[in-house]
Structures are given as C-alpha cells and as structure tokens.
Amino acid sequence: QNASRGRRQRRMHPNVSQGCQGGCATCSDYNGCLSCKPRLFFALERIGMKQIGVCLSSCPSGYYGTRYPDINKCTKCKADCDTCFNKNFCTKCKSGFYLHLGKCLDNCPEGLEANNHTMECVSIVHCEVSEWNPWSPCTKKGKTCGFKRGTETRVREIIQHPSAKGNLCPPTNETRKCTVQRKKCQKGERGKKGRERKRKKPNKGESKEAIPDSKSLESSKEIPEQRENKQQQKKRKVQDKQKSVSVSTVH
C-alpha cells in the first residue's frame, strides 16, 4: 500500500490543514492524515505507541475498504478472519478456523468436513466406482490350458476417491474359482518340465512361456480353449451365482 502521512502546511483552524502531503485531504501535525483524497482509504498505522492516520490505495490484510459519500476507510475484518470482502463475508480465515459461506467456524457443520489444506468446509465426497469389467480368461499359473480348475479375475475402476469422512471404496478386484474343459496345451503353450527350465535358450520353434499381465487378462477376448459346450455354460451360470470372492484391493 502506498501510504501518505500528511503534515500541516496551511491552517484552517487549530491543528487542521488542507495543505497536506500525498493522499491526505486534511491533516494535522499530531495525527497525520485526518481524511483522504478521493479513492484513497483512511487507515490507522501504529508507529511505536502512537497511531497515525495514513491514506492508502488499498487496505492492508485483515481490513476491507468501506466507501461512504466522500469517506473511504479501511475497516477491520472480524477477529477470526484474515481477509474479507466486507464485515459479514470472509474470504480467508485465521489459523484454526474453517471457511464456510463467508463465515469462519471452529468446526464444520453437519454434512460437511474440514479440508485442512484449503481450510474450508467442503461437502463430504463418497467413493464412486465403475461397473465391473468382464471376467478375465480362466487361468492357472498364468496359463489357459492344461488344467481343469483355475481362477478368473475382474476389476473395476475408482471414479471418485472419497474425502476423509466419505464412505470407503468397495473392493476393486474380485477373483473366483473356475473350471474349463480339460485340454492339453498345444506345443507352444506346453508347460516346461524341470530339465527344460534349466535351459538358457528355448529350442528352435519353442517360445518362452509368456505369463499374461493383468492388462492382457482384462483385454483378452475369448480364445479357443475357452469355448464351452452347453453343459459347461450351465455350470458357469451356477458359479456366477455362488461367487467365491477373494478381495485383493481396498481403497
């Protein structure tokens, strides 16, 4: 703020002058500015034990500008307020208080919670999750063949993380047992025997066993080993109803 501390130059009557420095309209030796020129705000500035009138282009922190006809003045925000728009509308609270609808509160009202970063009362946000993605292919040790019983997994995404007082997120992963028609693995899919695992390089025509990651499991379409006859489809429907679920992720 640009401050003007006027000093008397021409007497109007005892101790008051209009011939002041800077932004003062009237001033005195003892009190500094008494009133300010248009658009400037009067404020008291403490100098040691004394308060001197000054004229400012904008009010200091903790004050707001009030305008009356030919009188502009810096007026204090409420005691719990750091910056305000007017006496009844705070825009930033002092430490230890939370801002809610222009007021500074010790505690947030019911249905709201304190955001300790912004120091505001905010709506409680509950967790939101997406619909389940399709079940992954039935696998055992990363393979989709050479077994009868395996597991399949499905996932869902967190759309909205909860706030501190919000409802926690439900599981985002589900795994259940599944069965497939027992089918021998084809040459490229065959599980390695003990002696084969010791080899550093695969034989010509063999590929290293690829264990699908979760992304490839989620995005896999039906493969030949997963085609089911009508009897197996009925079994699957029953299994869907009696999901054997193990939770692997909770937020």
């Epitope: 109007m12 009557h13 101790n15 008051v16 209009q18 309209a25 009237t26 001033c27 005195s28 009190n31 500094g32 500015c33 008494l34 009133s35 300010c36 009067f42 008291l44 308060q51 001197i52 009138g53 009030t66 009356y68 006809p69 030919d70 009188i71 003045k73 007026t75 204090k76 409420k78 005691a79 006496k87």
Partner: antibody, heavy 119, light 107 residues
C-alpha cells in the same frame, strides 16, 4: 475558532416537515463533514446524518426516508429537513463537525435548538 | 448497526474519587471511539477520540483505554466540575451510534 449556530422554528405540527439551518463561521463548509445530531428530552444522543465538503450526504438508515440534508455554500450554511414528524421527533437538535477519522469526532458543536412536535 | 452498551447508567462519587465508565461495542470497532461530557442544557463536549487521545484543553485526569469491543473512560481524581453525563460514540462505520450515557452524581 469554529462556531456553529442552529436556527429554525421551535414548534412543528405532527405530519409536517421540521426545517433547521446551521450557520458556520470560522471555517468553510467546503471542507470537513457537517452533521446533525438530536437528543430527545432526558434521553441519549442520536446521529442523524452528514453532508460532506463536496455536498454528498449520508443519513442514518433509521431516518433516511424522512431526512434531507442540503447546503448553501454562499451563506456557509447547511440544513436539515425531517418530514412527517411525530411527537417522537421532539428533541434538541445539534449541528456538529469533524474533519476526518484521524481527528476528534464532533470537535465543534452548535448550542442546540429544541424542537417540539405538537398540535 | 453497531450497538454501544455503556455502564453503569449512573454512579454516585465524591470529589477525589477515581471513576471508571465502560462502553462495550457489539463488534470490534478498531479504536474508533470518542468520549463526550454533557452538562444540563449544554451541548456535548469532546474529551477523547481514537480511544485514548485527549482533545486540546481537556485536563489530564481524563484518560481513555481499550481495544476491540471494550473501552474505558477513567477520571483519576473527580473534581466538582466533572459531575455531568458522559457518552461514548463509535465511528468505525455508519451509522454512528452513541452509548446510552452515564450520569455521574455527587455522593
């Protein structure tokens, strides 16, 4: 020395308009803030409003709709009009001045004039 | 509007007594407070402004203090000419409002 003198009728009939004038000497009304204050008999003080050095006015919201403050710079006078008066407006009416927030509020007062509202 | 609550409404004291009058504002008035003395049939006279500044010519036995919402006028040693009614006035914002007054009477 700044002097303020109130003048006007001492008796006003209910529903009529009270009119008072404050004549200032020792200073110009084109500086400072020129106020009206009243005091019902045996009661406290009530601020009515002001007219500024430029002629702008501000009235107490409790009286605003009935109050008009004006000035005549050629005569160095300012005036109060209070319309639709009732017995509750019976009071000693004072004019007073101040020069801004940094100085004494109402450093100079008129002697006061009693206005009685009665039929 | 800011309300000014002055107390006591009256008090009896003797010459030489220390007298204290208080004024409580309904909200922080940031030191914008004046004290006035009024004698019967006379206009009020400003004693103190900006909480603690004595007007030229006012005896030093009058003093003012306070901050925020609570303000005090003290007469350190009451003199015969001090028997009067005292008013506080806030001028932190408009409308300006006075306290109800404190009548200081002879005991």
């Amino acid at each position: 020395e700044v002097q303020l003198v109130e003048s006007g009728p001492g008796l006003v009939k209910p529903s009529e308009t009270l009119s008072l004038t404050c004549t200032v000497s020792g200073d110009s009304i084109t500086s400072g803030y020129w106020n009206w204050i009243r005091q019902p008999p045996g009661k406290g003080l009530e601020w009515i409003g002001y007219i500024s050095y430029s002629g702008k006015t501000y009235q107490n919201p409790s009286l605003k709709s009935r109050v008009t403050i004006s000035r005549d710079t050629s005569k160095n006078q300012f005036s109060l009009k209070l319309s639709s008066v009732t017995a509750a407006d019976t009071a000693v009416y004072y004019c007073a001045t101040y020069y801004g927030y940094g100085g004494p509020h109402f450093a100079y007062w008129g002697q006061g004039t009693l206005v009685t509202v009665s039929s | 509007d800011i309300q000014m609550t002055q107390s006591p409404s009256s008090l009896s004291a003797s010459v030489g007594d220390r007298v204290t009058i208080t004024c409580k504002a309904s909200q922080d008035i940031d030191s914008y407070l004046s004290w006035f003395q009024q004698k019967p049939g006379k206009a009020p006279k400003t004693l103190i402004y900006l909480t603690n500044r004595l007007v030229d010519g006012v005896p030093s036995r009058f003093s003012g203090s306070g901050s925020g919402t609570d303000y005090t006028l003290t007469i350190s040693s009451l003199q015969p000419e001090d028997f009067a009614t005292y008013y506080c006035l806030h001028y932190d914002e408009f409308p300006l409002t006075f306290g109800q007054g404190t009548k200081v009477e002879i005991k």
